[in-house]
């Protein structure tokens, strides 16, 4: 206990064996001689406590009676701590010129009191002297008096017999272990324009630093040092910077030293490099100093935009690193001679040029048009004029092509292509016309004629295993009987497709070539003839004349024109009543016959029951001899659309009787209407 | 049509200075980029550099850069080349081009010959 | 700098032959928008030279049809169909593509 009552809770721990020692305890009492009787004359007593370093020692009175006389001089308790005299003490209470302790504590000044106890030769009446106690205590060295200097320059950590100081981050504390010097070197400035300023700046700058600041540009740039606001470094009247100092240099030279209270004039260092040195004593209590930089380069020339372009951005001048970019007015682009940019950035150099030229901004150019099949390309702005906005006009070849997709005028745009009036950029579609014919009708049905050149422009011969016919579609591909080309359908290339002449055998024809040939996946070879359709497709277009003309398919309403009894021509080279293969193009008109009538004439036998399908349908003359034959096969059965005057394919030659022309007996011919689905999507699959 | 008709032929000392023109007729002059292009004696071709007189904007090849200079008098149509600091070696003949969209080469000028000589 | 090199340099022909003239270049010409700028210049003795091909495959206005371009990349060739007495001369390559535009070393056509 005696060590907790005299020292107190020393931070809650007890001395171990290998923990830190504890100093002894330091405590007692004193007392005049014969305490608590009076004290003698002539008596002079002298007591020296001590306290172990970083302690103070504590004293008071619990009694004090003493004679008192004019500034104590008398008799007197005197307390002194080194060669301070902290008072001098009589009588029993304080009066103007001299003191008595009271309830006052006292406190020596280090870690040694001295207490001196003096009585002269006589006492007029009897005094019993004093009675005190001590102890020594922890001193607070982080508790200073008004006007004094902090023990710590930051933060001051008080602890049982001492004290130490710590620093505020960025800063570290120096060799004497109270002043915080800042850790202030090593800063790099990279940037084109900056601020640096002393530590704490505009407090005070710290003491004992030393600083250094490095301003680094890429090589090229020269840097510039403005001090701003305010300069106060300490000074001395007579010998330059001798405390504190700033000092600049650069691979070129060495300015300063500056200190003092008056901002430094401008520097241009004409260097990419510079090292600020600020060297600080342990005294001073000044503020400091801030420099603004910025830099500079030579200038690169002033870039003019082209004509038809602008910079961006703006700037009064370009230096090193400063970079402007071009921009293009609608309908120009950018070109470095012939060659296009999509973008173009310069850089300005070190050494003043850009690092690349400028480039023009060229009118936009579509080039020449594209050639249009089967159609032409007139320029219309001008002869040859392809730039922007720039019109031409494509036309289809007129009689046997009309325009599909669009009126055909395009405008060059400023993207570079050439557009129409709904913004497509692919050319349009010369799509031949369909169903003319140089033939007139008189509606009477009359025996087997000859064509003549272009009755029939769109008659194919198909010369494979066996002779056949088709019809042109478009124009590059061929509707046929499903039969006729069955054998070819893995062997396209073996078909020899003829058109544009009536002659069977003549040299004079136009050939084309089979690509694909696409049967109806409904049809069976030699099961009936329901689903007897095929397209071919040509592996190049034909070139349309009155003599090569597709025939139309038919619309939705054309089945107003197929009624019974209404007429429908079928043409082609087969047999004739002489039972050869004709030399010329023959035709025939020949009625519709009612469908019930057809499938009854076709129940009986050699015919199996169903031959006729609702995906056919039948055409010729009760009595017979007018009729498509062997030969024929795969041609049109065509129609006259009054409302289009046009010729469409209804129906396409299939079968039939034994014996053509047979009375009682009719042409079967695939009912084309009921296939429009299945043609398109080949063709536009394909 | 287009022309591109240059200046005479011309003899110069070591160190000095030649100046070519080059007068463009048959098109808008500012809109195409005229090249230069020399030919030493009995030698190939090679690509000095190019200017383009809507901005008079050049750019020369890096072997030049320090000796040409390439200009424009917009007002009679005229290009020139400078060359400096003359060496033998310099002893070519130069012409002019104009390029279209599909490359620098399309006209050519009738060329200058320039004998560097002491 | 991208560096253009024909063979043969020296080309002998008969009359009425075809000629071929190969060009190779260090890098490829490919653009950036998908073009080949690739030109072939014919000099004739004691002119200056003209512009035969351009995109490496495309005629100049004027030039006959004997004369065709091919190749791509940077492998590249000039074919003359049926050489006649006038394409006698020195025949260039030269690309367009990257600064500086350089050139082939020429080859010399003469008629054997």
């Known amino acids: 206990m005696r060590l907790l009552t005299l020292l107190g809770l020393l931070c809650g721990s007890v001395a171990t064996p290998l923990g830190p020692k504890w100093p002894e305890p330091v405590f007692g009492r004193l007392a005049s001689p014969g305490f608590p009787g009076e004290y003698a004359n002539d008596q002079e007593r002298r007591w020296t406590l001590t306290a172990p370093p970083g302690y103070r020692l504590r004293l008071y009175f619990t009694h004090f009676d003493l004679e008192l006389s004019h500034l104590c001089e008398y008799d007197f308790v005197k307390l002194s701590s080194g060669a301070k005299v902290l008072a001098t003490l009589c009588g029993q209470e304080s009066t103007d010129t001299e003191r008595a302790p009271g309830k006052d504590t006292f406190y020596s000044l280090g870690s040694s009191l001295d207490i001196t106890f003096r009585s002269d030769y006589s006492n007029e009446k009897p005094f019993t002297g004093f009675e005190a106690f001590y102890a020594a205590e922890d001193i607070d060295e982080c508790q200073v008096a008004p006007g004094e200097a902090p023990t710590c320059d930051h933060h001051c950590h008080n602890h049982l017999g001492g004290f130490y100081c710590s620093c505020r981050a960025g800063y570290v504390l120096h060799r004497n272990k109270r002043t915080c010097s800042a850790l202030c070197s090593g800063q790099v400035f990279t940037q084109r324009s900056g601020e640096l300023s002393s530590p704490e700046y505009p407090r005070p700058y710290p003491k004992l630093s030393s600083c250094t600041y490095s301003i680094s540009l890429e090589e090229g740039f020269s840097v510039i040092l403005d001090f701003v606001e305010s300069f106060d470094v300490e000074t001395h009247p007579e010998t330059l910077c001798p405390y504190d100092f700033l000092k600049i240099q650069t691979d070129r030279e060495e300015h300063g030293p500056f200190c003092g209270k008056t901002l430094p004039h401008r520097i241009e260092t004409k260097s990419n490099t510079v090292t600020i040195t600020f060297v600080t004593d342990e005294s001073g209590d000044h503020t400091g100093w801030k420099i603004h930089y910025t830099s500079t380069a030579q200038p690169c020339p002033y870039p003019m935009a082209p004509p038809n372009g602008h910079v961006s951005p703006v700037q009064a001048k370009y230096i090193l690193k400063d970079s402007f970019s071009i921009f293009c007015e609608t309908g120009y682009e950018l070109l470095q001679g012939h060659l296009p940019l999509k973008s173009f950035t310069a850089v300005c150099q070190k050494d003043g040029s850009w690092d690349r030229p400028m480039p023009a901004c060229s009118i936009v150019d579509c080039g020449p048009p594209d050639d249009l099949p089967s159609g032409r390309v007139e320029y219309i702005t001008g002869p040859g004029v392809t730039t922007y906005k720039a019109v031409i006009q494509y036309s289809c070849e007129e009689t046997f092509y009309t325009m599909k997709v669009n009126d055909g005028k395009y405008v060059c745009e400023a993207d570079g292509f050439w557009t129409s009036s709904k913004g497509e950029k692919s050319l349009p579609v010369c799509e031949p016309v369909c169903g003319l014919s140089a033939r007139t009708t008189g509606g009477r049905i009359y025996g087997g004629q000859k064509a003549k050149p272009g009755d029939f422009p769109w008659q194919v011969l198909i010369l494979g295993g066996t002779t056949a016919a088709g019809a042109l579609l478009y124009d590059n591909w061929v509707l046929t009987a499903a039969h006729a080309v069955y054998e070819q359908k893995h062997d396209a290339s073996a078909l020899d497709i003829r058109m544009g002449t009536l002659k069977r055998l003549s040299p004079h024809y136009t050939q084309a070539w089979s690509e694909a040939v696409f049967i109806h996946e409904g049809y069976t070879h030699d099961a009936g003839f329901d689903n007897d359709i095929a397209l071919i497709k040509l592996n190049n277009k034909v070139v349309i004349n009155s003599n090569i003309t597709p025939i139309c398919l038919p619309r939705k309403e054309a089945e107003s024109f197929m009624r019974t009894d209404d007429i429908g021509t079928a043409s082609g080279w087969g047999l004739t009543q002489r039972g050869f293969l004709a030399r010329n193009l023959m035709y025939v008109d020949i009625p519709i016959v009612d469908h019930q009538k057809c499938t009854a004439a076709y129940e009986k036998p050699p015919y199996p029951r169903g031959s006729v399908t609702a995906n056919m349908l039948c055409a010729g003359l009760e009595s017979g001899g007018k009729d498509s034959c062997r030969g024929d096969s795969g041609g049109a059965l065509v129609f006259l659309d009054s409302e289009t005057e046009r010729w469409f394919v209804g129906g396409i030659v299939s079968w039939g009787s034994m014996n053509c022309g047979e009375a009682g007996q009719y042409g079967v011919y695939t009912k084309v209407i009921n296939y429009i689905p299945w043609i398109e999507n080949i063709i536009s699959d394909f | 049509q287009v022309q591109l008709v240059q200046s005479g032929a011309e003899v110069k000392k070591p160190g000095a200075s030649v100046k070519v023109s080059c007068k463009a007729s048959?098109?808008?002059?500012?809109?195409?980029?005229i090249n230069w292009v020399r030919q030493a004696p009995g030698q190939g071709l090679e690509w000095m550099g190019w200017i383009f007189p809507g901005s008079e904007s050049a750019y020369h090849s890096e072997k030049f850069k320090a000796r040409v200079t390439m200009t424009v008098d917009t007002s009679i149509s005229t290009a020139y080349m400078e060359l400096s600091r003359l060496r033998s070696d310099d002893t070519a003949v130069y012409y002019c081009t104009r390029g279209d969209r599909s490359g620098p080469f399309a006209y050519w000028g009738q060329g200058t010959l320039v004998t560097v000589s002491s | 700098d991208v560096v253009m090199t024909q063979s043969p340099l020296s080309l002998p022909v008969t009359l009425g032959q075809p000629a071929s003239i190969s060009c190779k270049s260090s890098q490829s010409l490919l653009y950036s928008n998908g073009k080949t700028y690739l030109n072939w210049l014919q000099q004739r003795p004691g002119q200056s030279p003209r512009r035969l091909i351009y995109?490496?495959?495309k005629l100049d206005s004027g030039v006959p049809d004997r004369f065709s371009g091919s190749g791509s990349g940077a492998d590249f060739t000039l074919k003359i169909s049926r050489v006649e007495a006038e394409d006698v001369g020195v025949y260039y390559c030269v690309q367009v593509t990257h600064f500086p535009f350089t050139f082939g070393q020429g080859t010399k056509l003469e008629i054997k």
């Open positions: 995109l490496v495959s």
């Open positions: 048959g098109y808008t002059f500012t809109d195409y980029y």
